[in-house]
């Protein structure tokens, strides 16, 4: 990897628990500032792959509230407006680090977690084997 | 939002830090066991939005490497597997927490921060304006 | 034309299990889509279960937990696992086929169905 010089001003770190324990603020910096706000906001509904989306909310989570993706049909939508079954909405996924309070109910002490998200889906050709 | 009993074995927190700062454990818990392990990986060549993959690295943040998706085409592939332009292949974007090392070059000092990363493109209809 | 012949139907008790397969005629590339559906008397056709080629699956509601569907893609299979089986169950199950391909990459539109395996759940 590679080697960070290391900050004299840095916080000290017990040996016992450094580099698996750190101090986290959790004072948000949104590095999103000049993203268009629309976004993705209507897409699940445009896409020829739609989805609906699921809001999946846990307390002992940080962020406690992750919207989740489920494609609404197992085909796509084609040019009449009709579900095609040559096709597949399939889910686009992504792994998302959030944390977890460890031990549990504790305000100010948490674990790394990695977590397997659906954002929103695609429409994809199946594998198809083409013989000359 | 919702309140949840401290446990009493709960490491303390200093009031002039507290909520700002907290430990995390590193030691990252993986909760994607049962996930299908061939997911989504080769749904970017396959859709009828296809994308490319780019390697963004930032060693001042955890984790330092993210993959972000940039669409192929501005419109979507068809049938014939041309692109036809009366559709839009869009990214699929979604804010994410990463940790920034603050101050800088501190191996075990971190603050949150949300980036919005595109995790896929998804083909959608273009917003047409009917006129009466 | 494709065709699909479905066996594994019959008497079984209530909480019992069946297993239903549904084959099709092999002289195509792909069906990216196999179902079941159920038709009890007097009701109209039902959807039970769905899988895509890429192994995304529906369900009714009312089946989730209970039936699993699977898939034999290369041999062109689709299977239901019926557990825990309830008198309401009991319906005459047929297999649906579409979004087939064949060998030249090319789309049949046709939506075929089985002749249909009965089912019965009763004590």
């Known amino acids: 990897g590679i080697t960070i010089p290391r900050n004299p001003g840095c916080p000290n770190s017990e040996d016992k628990n450094f580099p698996r324990t750190v101090m986290v603020n959790l004072n948000i910096h949104n590095r999103n500032t000049n993203t268009n706000p629309k976004r993705s906001s209507d897409y699940y509904n445009r896409s020829t792959s739609p989805w609906n989306l699921h809001r999946n909310e846990d307390p002992e989570r940080y962020p406690s509230v992750i919207w989740e993706a489920k494609c609404r049909h197992l085909g796509c939508i084609n040019a009449d407006g009709n579900v095609d079954y040559h096709m597949n909405s399939v889910p686009i996924q992504q792994e998302i680090l959030v944390l977890r309070r460890e031990p549990p109910h504790c305000p100010n002490s948490f674990r790394l977690e990695k977590i397997l998200v659906s954002v929103g889906c695609t429409c994809v050709t199946p594998i198809v084997h083409h013989v000359a | 939002g919702i309140t949840i009993p401290r446990n009493p074995g709960c490491p303390n927190s200093e009031d002039k830090n507290f909520p700002r700062t907290v430990m995390v454990n590193l030691n990252i818990h993986n909760r994607n066991t049962n996930t299908n392990p061939k997911r989504s990986s080769d749904y970017y060549n396959r859709s009828t939005s296809p994308w490319n993959l780019h390697r963004n690295e930032d060693p001042e943040r955890y984790p330092s490497v993210i993959w972000e998706a940039k669409c192929r085409h501005l419109g979507c592939i068809n049938a014939d597997g041309n692109v036809d332009y009366h559709m839009n292949s869009v990214p699929i974007q979604q804010e994410i927490l990463v940790l920034r090392r603050e101050p800088p070059h501190c191996p075990n000092s971190f603050r949150l921060e949300k980036i919005l990363v595109s995790v896929g493109c998804t083909c959608v209809t273009p917003i047409v304006h009917h006129v009466a | 034309e494709v065709q699909l012949v479905e066996s594994g139907g019959g008497l079984v008790q209530p909480g019992g299990s069946l297993r239903l397969s549904c084959a099709a005629s092999?002289?195509?590339?792909?069906?990216?889509?196999m179902a079941w559906y159920r038709q009890a008397p007097g009701n109209q056709r039902e959807l039970v279960a769905a899988m895509t080629s890429d192994a995304t699956t529906e369900y009714a509601d009312s089946v989730k937990g209970r039936f699993t569907i699977s898939r034999d893609i290369p041999e062109n299979t689709v299977y239901l696992q019926m557990n825990s089986l309830k008198p309401e169950d009991t319906a005459v199950y047929y297999c649906?086929?579409?979004?087939?391909?064949?060998?030249?990459?090319?789309?049949?539109?046709?939506?075929?169905w089985g002749q249909g395996t009965q089912v019965t759940v009763s004590s």
């Open positions: 649906n086929a579409k979004g087939i391909w064949d060998y030249l990459g090319r789309r049949d539109f046709g939506d075929y």
């Open positions: 092999r002289n195509i590339n792909i069906i990216n889509y």
